[in-house]
């Protein structure tokens, strides 16, 4: 069977939504009313990987686009990027590790840890309109906690 994928949106713990910023970048900003339609809808795939009650391995693609969030080294630093893939081959159950995030939910906090780079998390800045990035610190200035809203296909 193909991998099961469900559509969802994400908001950080400051209630900022994620939107496209150019062809290969996401940014986080507060949206209201009609502007909410700008937010990115992810296709979250339940992929192969180590799993527990609190931790589920997922891949985060952009709905109806052949773009996936991936984690790679750039200038020796783990970096979040949007990577273009061949839609004939993706999504799949055995995603390459750079595409895999551990969705971790504990005490109303949802984090996305890179499987490729443990202890690095999808992060947003406190400031408005800044890029979504891969951060190596939790509990600091940058935001690593999200809420997730599943949406009908």
């Amino acid at each position: 069977a193909p991998v099961r994928s469900l559509n969802c949106t994400l908001r950080d713990s400051q209630q900022k939504s994620l939107v496209m910023s150019g062809p290969y970048e996401l940014k986080a900003l507060h949206l209201q009313g009609q502007d909410m339609e700008q937010q990115v809808v992810f296709s979250m795939s339940f992929v192969q990987g180590e799993e527990s009650n609190d931790k589920i391995p997922v891949a985060l693609g952009l709905k109806e686009k052949n773009l996936y969030l991936s984690c790679v080294l750039k200038d020796d630093k783990p970096t979040l990027q949007l990577e273009s893939v061949d839609p004939k081959n993706y999504p799949k159950k055995k995603m390459e590790k750079r595409f895999v995030f551990n969705k971790i939910e504990i005490n109303n906090k949802l984090e996305f840890e890179s499987a490729q780079f443990p202890n690095w998390y999808i992060s947003t800045s406190q400031a408005e309109n800044m890029p979504v990035f891969l951060g190596g610190t939790k509990g600091g200035q940058d935001i690593t906690d999200f809420t997730m809203q599943f949406v009908s296909s």
Partner: antibody, heavy 119, light 107 residues
Framework: EVQLVESGGGVVQPGRSLRLSCSSS????????MSWVRQAPGKGLEWVAY????????YYPDSVKGRFTISRDNSKNTLFLQMDSLRAEDTAVYYC????????????WGQGTPVTVSS | GIQMTQSPSSLSASVGDRVTITCRAS??????LTWYQQTPGKAPKLLIY???TLADGVPSRFSGSSSGTDYTFTISSLQPEDIATYYC?????????FGQGTKLQIT
């Protein structure tokens, strides 16, 4: 033994609000995703709300989106459904059920609480 | 979304009979299907998940199978306590939807 006990149902006028509760026992509530499923009189089943085990993930079908809000208090082993702007078509028995988006099915159910929306 | 069409909507059978209920999905759901039993005045009860896996404590006379987008629920030897309405439900893509139910009566 797993127990789910719903309360808070009743008769309410269209446009008004109602809050349902579901008290749980017999399992570690904070480890399970939870849902509300309803059944209109003489009709089938409809899944109307979901919340993940920690409360960070939610889902609502289009029929109730923007009107219903699911929440939970893991310290009190209790699930809630806030229903606003109620309509006649929301009349149903509302069941609290264990399970949701990830597992996909509902393995434990409460006995249900009836909600009637009528002027 | 994916629609689940259940048939028949009602049926009568005798104790000891083999009973079959079918659910057809409007798209491929890859065995992401469950069956529930609802006896009159009670809450639904999970019987089968993943198309053919029996839930804990469910008697072995109940079984499930699949062929393409058709899913079959079978009671090998009907018992009086099996009088109920049976529902299928898919969980492949949101929204997860239920079939309209099959009411089973004893003749």
């Amino acid at each position: 033994e797993v127990q789910l006990v719903e309360s808070g149902g009743g008769v309410v006028q269209p446009g008004r609000s109602l809050r349902l509760s579901c008290s749980s026992s017999g399992f570690i509530f904070s480890r399970y995703d939870m849902s509300w499923v309803r059944q209109a009189p003489g009709k089938g089943l409809e899944w109307v709300a979901y919340i993940s085990h920690g409360g960070a993930g939610t889902y609502y079908p289009d029929s109730v989106k923007g009107r219903f809000t699911i929440s939970r208090d893991n310290s009190k082993n209790t699930l809630f459904l806030q229903m606003d702007s109620l309509r006649a078509e929301d009349t149903a028995v509302y069941y609290c059920a264990r399970g949701g988006v990830y597992k996909g099915y509902f393995d434990e159910w409460g006995q249900g609480t009836p909600v009637t929306v009528s002027s | 979304g994916i629609q689940m069409t259940q048939s028949p909507s009602s049926l009568s059978a005798s104790v000891g009979d083999r009973v079959t209920i079918t659910c057809r999905a409007s798209g491929n759901i890859y065995n992401y299907l469950t069956w529930y039993q609802q006896t009159p005045g009670k809450a639904p009860k999970l019987l089968i998940y993943n198309a053919k896996t029996l839930a804990d404590g469910v008697p072995s006379r109940f079984s499930g199978s699949s062929s393409g987008t058709d899913y079959t629920f079978t009671i090998s030897s009907l018992q009086p306590e099996d009088i109920a309405t049976y529902y299928c439900q898919h969980f492949w893509t949101l929204p997860y939807t239920f079939g309209q139910g099959t009411k089973l009566q004893i003749t």
